[in-house]
Interface confidence: low
């Protein structure tokens, strides 16, 4: 069936060195554990994180990104699935787009991660 | 080490189609880009579009839009280019093009290359 | 679509000579730049790729800089095998070479 997919609408922000969520989700809801989930880095990207087959392909994914993601599926069931960033670095910023592949339907969705320095909001005294 | 290896010469006629083959080995295919450059006589290098087999869909540059189609079977890790309504003026060596594993993010590549193919229009 | 001024398109050098060839962006690309080497009925091969970066193999005599719009490709010491025409390339989106620089025998 189709469905589109649905990410968050304004830029997510993050602090070099924490971890960040980048939720999406098929509307409307369904089981999406059969489906292919992923994040890529547009235009031309490198893989950050795929799921496929019922598990997570960590060799397919971008070594920048190895050892730092997490596909939070909790809520797989219900076609919300969430991406989970550790250690967050500059050149995390930008463009990020997720998508679900049922057999060969897919569709995505856009998000902008903004990444800032801690140590800039750091009030003196 | 990452290796491509192309299809053979065509000789085609004008407003015929002519597609070229490029089959990687020694690597991960699905993740990473696989760009189709040609060159003709005497020329410079130009980029004509680009794909990342696992998600399937294509990028083209303008210049192109609407002739080439780009596509790859994961399955023989092969990437494909058909180029259409050919004119004398496609004659070139077209080259596909991969990027290495390890690179930055965001990083199209261009770092492996195939051995070309060349491909004469002529009536 | 962003455009690659290479300069210049030809350069006459002799073994042993510092040779340079600049390359423009019509706008920023960060350091998305890489600079290809291609001799004559050969497919091109990587030498810089993030517009500094060396590729592994290639000789330390080349080298690259710059970021933003302007990027140099640099060759200290020319070496006979080094006489071939060199192109940059961007890929901060649609991708674009220049037009390449010959280096020849002077």
């Known amino acids: 069936g189709q469905f589109r997919v649905i990410g968050p609408r304004h830029p997510i922000r993050a602090l070099v060195g924490d971890e960040v969520e980048l939720p999406c989700r098929i509307s409307p809801g369904k089981n999406a554990t059969g489906m292919e989930v992923g994040w890529y880095r547009p235009p031309f990207s490198r893989v950050v994180h795929l799921y496929r087959n019922g598990k997570d392909q960590d060799g397919d994914q971008a070594p920048e990104y190895r050892g730092r993601t997490e596909l939070l599926k909790d809520a797989i069931g219900e076609g919300k699935v969430t991406l989970r960033i550790r250690n967050v670095r500059f050149s995390d910023e930008g463009g990020f787009t997720c998508f679900f592949r049922d057999h060969s339907y897919q569709e995505e969705a856009a998000m902008e991660l903004k990444v800032e320095d801690p140590f800039y909001w750091v009030s003196p005294g | 080490q990452m290796q491509l290896v192309q299809s053979g010469a065509e000789v085609k006629k004008p407003g015929s189609s002519v597609k070229v083959s490029c089959k990687a080995s020694?690597?991960?295919?699905?993740?990473?880009?696989i760009s189709w450059v040609r060159q003709a006589p005497g020329q410079g290098l130009e980029w004509m579009g680009g794909?990342?087999?696992?998600?399937?869909?294509?990028n083209y540059a303008q210049k192109f839009q609407g002739r080439v189609t780009i596509t790859a079977d994961e399955s023989t890790s092969t990437a494909y280019m058909e180029l259409s309504s050919l004119r004398s003026e496609d004659t070139a060596v077209y080259y596909c093009?991969?990027?290495?594993?390890?690179?930055?993010?965001?990083?199209?590549?261009?770092?492996?290359w195939g051995q070309g193919t060349l491909v004469t229009v002529s009536s | 679509d962003i455009q690659m001024t290479q300069s210049p398109s030809t350069l006459s050098a002799s073994v042993g000579d510092r040779v340079t060839t600049t390359c423009r962006a019509s706008q920023g690309i960060s350091n998305y730049l890489a600079w290809f080497q291609q001799k004559p009925g050969k497919a091109p091969k990587s030498l810089i790729y993030?517009?500094?970066s060396l590729q592994s193999g290639v000789p330390s005599r080349f080298s690259g800089g710059g970021s933003g719009t302007d990027f140099t490709l640099t060759i200290n010491s020319l070496q006979p095998e080094d006489f071939a025409t060199y192109y940059c390339?961007?890929?901060?989106?649609?991708?674009?070479f220049g037009q390449g620089t010959k280096v020849e025998i002077k």
């Open positions: 993030a517009a500094s």
């Open positions: 794909i990342i087999p696992i998600f399937g869909t294509a």
């Open positions: 390339l961007h890929d901060y989106n649609y991708p674009t």
């Open positions: 020694g690597g991960t295919f699905s993740s990473y880009a």
């Open positions: 093009a991969r990027a290495r594993e390890g690179l930055l993010v965001n990083y199209y590549g261009m770092d492996v």
